[in-house]
């Protein structure tokens, strides 16, 4: 019986260009976490595989950087980034827990686009 | 620079098998990880599987997993993918790599379509 449960970050929001730490804690449970991956929609971003370590996948290695602990942090962020991310920790003996998390990434403050009017 | 050649691949239909080599010049490992990896048509390249030098640790695709074996020989410096039960969708250019995060060298890949 799986008794565990996730907690995420929820939804969450963070400026373009920014950065943004995706955090998932599997609780309530004495399952064994053999496994974790971030995945966005159907892409994987990475794994966290208790044996070989951290893996980023190649379309995302210049962006994504592995944890802290088993969570992920996304840079340089860009509004194609909005949208569903999942945690999916693989365990023993309970199965698979998956969380999600919705990212929405904004356009930049006024203070990046530069000053909309000259002060005297 | 270590030269990757990667052979093995072909036209098989739905359900057939296919073993894939992947031979090194010098280690088939840079670091503790080597991988196979596959790009089809019009998709980012992805990791298939994975395993560690000493053979103890493997990680696969939850689309390859209870199809696809990856191994390894060190004393070859060669790496092999067993690929059964292949779908359509298995159809890609299929690469190794000696690391599972540094893509420093690629080799030429190998063709694989699964089709009737």
């Known amino acids: 019986m799986m008794t565990g449960t996730i907690e995420t970050t929820g939804n969450i929001s963070a400026e373009k260009g920014g950065s943004i730490i995706l955090q998932c804690h599997l609780s309530s449970t004495t399952a064994q976490v053999t496994q974790v991956n971030w995945e966005q929609q159907d892409q994987l971003l990475a794994i966290c595989n208790a044996d070989l370590g951290w893996h980023i996948s190649p379309s995302f290695k210049d962006r994504v950087a592995p944890g802290p602990g088993l969570g992920l942090t996304l840079q340089s962020l860009t509004v194609n980034d909005t949208g569903e991310y999942f945690c999916i920790y693989h365990t023993y003996p309970d199965g698979t827990y998956t969380g999600r998390i919705f990212l929405e990434v904004l356009e930049s403050s006024v203070a990046e686009h530069g000053a909309r009017f000259q002060i005297p | 620079e270590v030269q990757l050649v990667e052979s093995g691949g072909g036209l098989v239909q739905p359900g057939g098998s296919l073993r894939l080599s992947c031979a090194a010049s010098g280690s088939i490992f840079s670091g503790n990880v080597m991988g196979w990896f596959r790009q089809a048509p019009g998709k980012e390249r992805e990791l298939v599987a994975a395993?560690?030098?000493?053979?103890?640790?493997?990680v696969y695709a939850d689309s390859v997993k209870g199809r696809f074996t990856i191994s390894a020989d060190n004393s070859k410096n060669t790496a092999y993918l067993q690929m059964n039960s292949l779908k359509p969708e298995d159809t890609a250019v299929y690469y190794c790599?000696?690391?599972?995060?540094?893509?420093?060298?690629w080799g030429q890949g190998t063709l694989v379509t699964v089709s009737s």
């Open positions: 790599a000696r690391d599972w995060n540094l893509f420093d060298y």
């Open positions: 395993i560690s030098n000493s053979a103890s640790s493997t």
